[in-house]
Interface confidence: low
């Protein structure tokens, strides 16, 4: 399977809320010893390999922002912690899966990585990750919605492996 | 103030290839993104892709994918569009252009490239 | 791709009149930005999110308009507003540009 970004640069104003989105791509093995691990963690610019170090979003970890559940399946960080810190995540039954982050400030503005971890019981994992850039902007010339950038066909199928 | 200075004139023979840079001054290089837009002569204003100097993204109008390519040099603040296997239909003046979320608020003054055998 | 269709493609008015010019789109989008080019000019930011005039544009410039249908309009035209005017949709990719309304003054 691969991990897709479908837009690669997220330019919001102060005080809007945003929407990060992933998605699962290629086949994916419903089989009853299958279970993906999805979360998200911010990252830095300019490492030889993108998404290596991993960042606490908002002071979570990205062992508080994960998912956990079989295939396609719905799932979504409904626990307090996550909340009180005006965030959350979420997985549709399309391989979709997201991060809201509410009440954006400067302080937001980085670099944003979800990750995929294919856990074969008592055998192997899978990983892959995707990656997308956040501008948080603020004044006269601040966007009044958030500003998507698509990603170039070679980006959206971000299949690094973790 | 902002500027985006670009590169000269340029003749150039069907299937070469060639590349105009634009020089930013005046503002935070890596933050905004730089759009290129073509017109060519006596004819209207089109997209040809953008680049994202903080990250090095590039976003090409599927038209031009495969013989545009956009790279930029952090160190000198500097976008380059390179378009390849000219053609006399690529003679346009090439403008760079920095983008402010959803407008291009400063343009180049413009290449010229004229491509003729 | 959200083609823009821009009427009309030439006008000559005179000074002092209304102008006004339409960017019809193909399908339904956020906002519209309007841009100015002058003979031998690079273009100029006009209008950006359909109606807000950017630093330095005369008040006579108005912009409106949503969904798919957004109107430039000049009020009492002066002569150095001869020029072609662009619409451009930044809102669904790609990125695409109006074929352009040239301003001839009388």
């Known amino acids: 399977f691969k991990v897709a970004t479908p837009y690669s640069l997220y330019v919001c104003p102060e005080g809007q809320n945003v929407t990060l989105t992933c998605r699962l791509l290629g086949p994916v093995d419903k089989g009853h010893d299958v279970t993906f691990y999805k979360t998200w963690y911010r990252s830095s610019r300019g490492e030889v390999q993108t998404c290596s170090e991993r960042r606490p979003i908002r002071n979570l970890t990205f062992q508080d922002l994960h998912l956990h559940h079989g295939g396609h399946q719905a799932a979504n960080t409904s626990h307090d912690l996550a909340q009180r810190h005006g965030l959350e995540s979420a997985s549709d039954h399309h391989g979709n899966f997201s991060i809201t982050m509410r009440n954006l400030t400067l302080l937001d503005s980085g670099l944003y990585c979800c990750l995929v971890v294919e856990i074969r019981h008592h055998h192997s994992e899978h990983r892959v990750h995707g990656a997308m850039e956040l501008q948080v902007q603020t004044g006269k010339d601040a966007p009044s919605n958030c500003v998507v950038y698509p990603s170039s066909s070679q980006d959206s199928e971000n299949i690094t492996a973790a | 103030q902002v500027q985006l200075v670009q590169s000269g004139a340029e003749v150039k023979k069907p299937g070469a290839s060639v590349k105009v840079s634009c020089k930013a001054s005046g503002y935070t290089f890596t933050d905004y993104v730089i759009s290129w837009v073509r017109q060519a002569p006596g004819q209207g204003l089109e997209w040809m892709g953008e680049?994202?100097?903080?990250?090095?993204?590039?976003y090409y109008y599927e038209k031009f994918k495969g013989r545009v390519t956009m790279t930029r040099d952090t160190s000198t603040s500097t976008v380059y569009m390179e378009l390849s296997s000219l053609r006399s239909e690529d003679t346009a003046v090439y403008y760079c252009a920095r983008v402010l979320v959803s407008v291009m608020d400063y343009w180049g003054q413009g290449t010229l490239v004229t491509v003729s055998s | 791709e959200i083609v823009l269709t821009q009427s009309p493609d030439f006008q000559s008015v005179t000074p002092k009149e209304k102008v006004t010019i339409t960017c019809s789109a193909s399908?339904?989008?956020?906002?519209i930005t309007w841009y100015q080019q002058k003979p031998d000019q690079s273009p100029k930011l006009l209008i950006k999110?359909?109606?807000k005039l950017a630093s330095g544009v005369p008040s006579r410039f108005s912009g409106s308009g949503s969904g798919t249908d957004f109107t430039l309009t000049i009020n009492s035209l002066e002569a150095e507003d001869a020029a072609t005017y662009y619409c451009?949709?930044?809102?669904?990719?790609?990125?695409?540009f109006g074929q352009g309304t040239r301003l001839e003054i009388k």
């Open positions: 399908s339904s989008i956020n906002y």
């Open positions: 999110d359909t109606s």
């Open positions: 451009h949709q930044r809102s669904s990719y790609p990125w695409t």
């Open positions: 680049i994202y100097p903080g990250s090095g993204n590039t």
